[in-house]
């Protein structure tokens, strides 16, 4: 069997809402993945599990099941959404995210995703981790790759 390549492209959109009284931030983050099947047979993308971390704390998890089948030598782009909550110990971020005097309220989030594929009864897992900028102050749609956070912590490809 040849490889199945999973490429995390980036954040596609982030929709934000707030709980004023509980000083809580709700971020619905939609991410984009490219999955390439380099084989001469079809593979099934069985599930995608994702989680988002802020400041080493998991703030959101998502799981998609029975997603798609990728044909031989084909590539599919898949979007998945992770609902996240920044609250309680992190409610200090509410002030930053709702501060009117600044235009962009970027926070750094670590996106983790694991893709499980199957073919001929064989299962394979591929994981990716990326640090991304997300604006927690307004609804934002990103150009693919625009939210990339480039620093020494960025895992190597």
């Amino acid at each position: 069997p040849r490889s199945i390549d999973v490429k995390y492209i980036g954040v596609k959109s982030a929709y934000v809402s707030y709980d004023v009284q509980k000083r809580t931030i709700y971020l619905n983050i939609t991410n984009t993945l490219n999955i390439t099947n380099n084989n001469y047979y079809s593979v099934e993308v069985e599930n995608i599990t994702a989680q988002v971390q802020f400041s080493k704390t998991v703030i959101g998890k998502a799981r998609l099941n029975n997603i798609t089948i990728i044909g031989p030598l084909d590539m599919k782009q898949i979007d998945y959404t992770v609902p996240t909550v920044i609250a309680e110990e992190m409610s200090y971020m509410y002030d930053f995210c709702t501060l009117i005097s600044i235009k962009v309220h970027n926070i750094v989030l670590m996106m983790q995703v694991t893709v499980t594929t199957t073919y001929f009864g064989h299962s394979e897992q591929i994981s990716q981790e990326r640090y991304q900028y997300v604006d927690c102050g307004r609804n934002t749609t990103y150009q693919l790759g625009q939210s990339e956070y480039l620093n020494v912590l960025q895992p190597q490809q």
Partner: antibody, heavy 121, light 112 residues
Framework: QVQLQQSGAELAKPGASVKLSCKAS????????MHWVKQRPGQGLEWIGY????????KNNQKFKDKVTLTADKSSSTAYMQLSSLTYEDSAVYYC??????????????WGTGTTVTVSS | DIVMTQAAPSVPVTPGESVSISCRSS???????????SYWFLQRPGQSPQLLIY???NLASGVPDRFSGSGSGTAFTLRISRVEAEDVGVYYC?????????FGGGTKLEIK
Amino acid sequence: QVQLQQSGAELAKPGASVKLSCKASGYTFTSYWMHWVKQRPGQGLEWIGYVNPSSGYTKNNQKFKDKVTLTADKSSSTAYMQLSSLTYEDSAVYYCAREGGSISDWYFDVWGTGTTVTVSS
Amino acid sequence: DIVMTQAAPSVPVTPGESVSISCRSSKSLLHSNGNTYSYWFLQRPGQSPQLLIYRMSNLASGVPDRFSGSGSGTAFTLRISRVEAEDVGVYYCMQHLEYPYTFGGGTKLEIK
């Protein structure tokens, strides 16, 4: 129906500690934050703090930071407030109150029966 | 901390008449989402407080429509039309916007 049943009156000496309880019934305990409010005899209401029964997270009024410990037991649907190093100023009625509602629209919709704490030597 | 002030410690009223109880906050309780986070509670003698009005003007469940709330960002009014004997007690305003939540000192409604 939704009820908050608080423990009975407490008589304690200065320097001692007391633990008050607030047993919730008629709703899902972990779905709503529980707040505590103090009322000294013949006086107004003072917000002490809250506990989120789901996570155990608490937030206290700074004024009560070293005085109060808030906890919750999911298995018995009971919230607790411990008052330590009691002084005469701690003599009051203490209420628990459920914070009902929904996002950005919360309010104290159900109040407990109140527990009277008397500090006397 | 936001200070809630109820200037009148007590208000006398004749049954069947209307009465207004006022409250002021040291900071605006009007949020940019359009909601005003002021609340009114009634504490009848020997009882626990009960919610009357939430978000300045919304009537709580089970409260008679004789009660109504109004105001601006910093000035709030609770109006009781056709006062009944059961309305006696202490009325408290509260801000539910910023920690620590704070209450007014209370206004006692007394029947003449």
